[in-house]
């Protein structure tokens, strides 16, 4: 999906109001220094592409993030503010969700969410630069 036509201001507002809180709740008990940020993004559409991938694409050691509250809210936000997102992405992410069984917060998942927090912060910084 091409995130170029999204309403970035509205996505930022949703992130600051609600998604960020759920990400921080998920990370509770860990320190921001516990993980190194290895994933980066260069502009707003690129940041959303990386956020989408990290949130919904299962990895071998962390397969359960799409079920989390922050993921459901991310999906709703992208569906609302990125025209055409739902048609191209929702069915794919729902298929992934059905494929998963248990929900375990592994260290690898915490690391992935730490990367997500970094990507979202980067998204907001690139937004501020444009204004």
């Amino acid at each position: 999906y091409d995130f170029t036509n999204c309403d970035f201001q509205k996505i930022e507002a949703d992130y600051l109001r609600t998604i960020s809180k759920d990400l921080i709740t998920y990370m509770s008990g860990t320190k921001s220094t516990d993980f190194n940020n290895t994933v980066s993004c260069s502009n707003r559409p690129h940041c959303l592409t990386e956020i989408q991938s990290l949130t919904f694409n299962p990895t071998p050691r962390c397969a359960s993030l799409a079920k989390e509250m922050f993921a459901r809210k991310t999906k709703a936000t992208l569906a609302l503010w990125c025209p055409g997102y739902s048609e191209t992405q929702i069915n794919a992410t729902q298929a992934m969700k059905k494929a998963r069984k248990s929900k375990v917060t592994t260290n690898k998942c915490l690391e992935q969410v730490s990367q997500l927090l970094g990507l979202w912060r980067r998204f907001i910084r690139t937004l501020l630069k444009k204004q």
């Epitope: 109001r17 809210k73 609302l80 025209p83 739902s86 048609e87 929702i90």
Partner: antibody
Framework: QVQLVQSGAEVKKPGSSVKVSCKAS????????INWVRQAPGQGLEWMGV????????IYAEKFQGRVTITADESTSTAYMELSSLRSEDTAVYYC?????????????WGQGTLVTVSS | QSALTQPPSASGSPGQSVTISCSGS?????????VSWYQQHPGKAPKLMIY???KRPSGVPDRFSGSKSGNTASLTVSGLQAEDEADYYC???????????FGGGTKLTVL
Amino acid sequence: QVQLVQSGAEVKKPGSSVKVSCKASGFTFGSYGINWVRQAPGQGLEWMGVIVPLVGVTIYAEKFQGRVTITADESTSTAYMELSSLRSEDTAVYYCARGQEYFYWYFDLWGQGTLVTVSS
Amino acid sequence: QSALTQPPSASGSPGQSVTISCSGSSSDIGGYNRVSWYQQHPGKAPKLMIYDVSKRPSGVPDRFSGSKSGNTASLTVSGLQAEDEADYYCSSYAGTDTFILFGGGTKLTVL
């Protein structure tokens, strides 16, 4: 049973406000969009706004901006539409309608409608 | 004044086909494949008949079909039946600010 049940008919004076409720059952309320659509007597459908409780987003039609407030209480699976500064032209049947989960733009479930009459 | 334009009335005899048009712009119908059609009988709530231009919800007869060309969407009812007599409304997604627009409605009469 999957349904939306709205509050009863109201008679209001011009200049006052009305608050209509819409109670959802049989589905996960928060993930869907709850829209409000009105229909004046003998007229067509008019979209007023939507709330997506999951992310706390509300979008209002420009015509109603500043006069309508849509809220939701996830604990009771109930959405509310409050319309202020009522005038006679606001006499209409007000419907709540469910926008599909993540596909918020089509309405696959409707409430029975609430008639609001504005008269002095 | 509706943002989407529909003919006020349409009619056909039982067994015939009738097509109702819905005209918009590149900002709504032409810009997205997010057109819906609703049927409304007198005194009843509307019912979703078509969504995403041409998809039918379960329970809706396959006599109802939708299509789109440019900025105009169409609803076709084939093999007209008496119970198809109702008002029909088109609706389109219109971007992240306007969000939803409705047509003015078309009264379908089965002769």
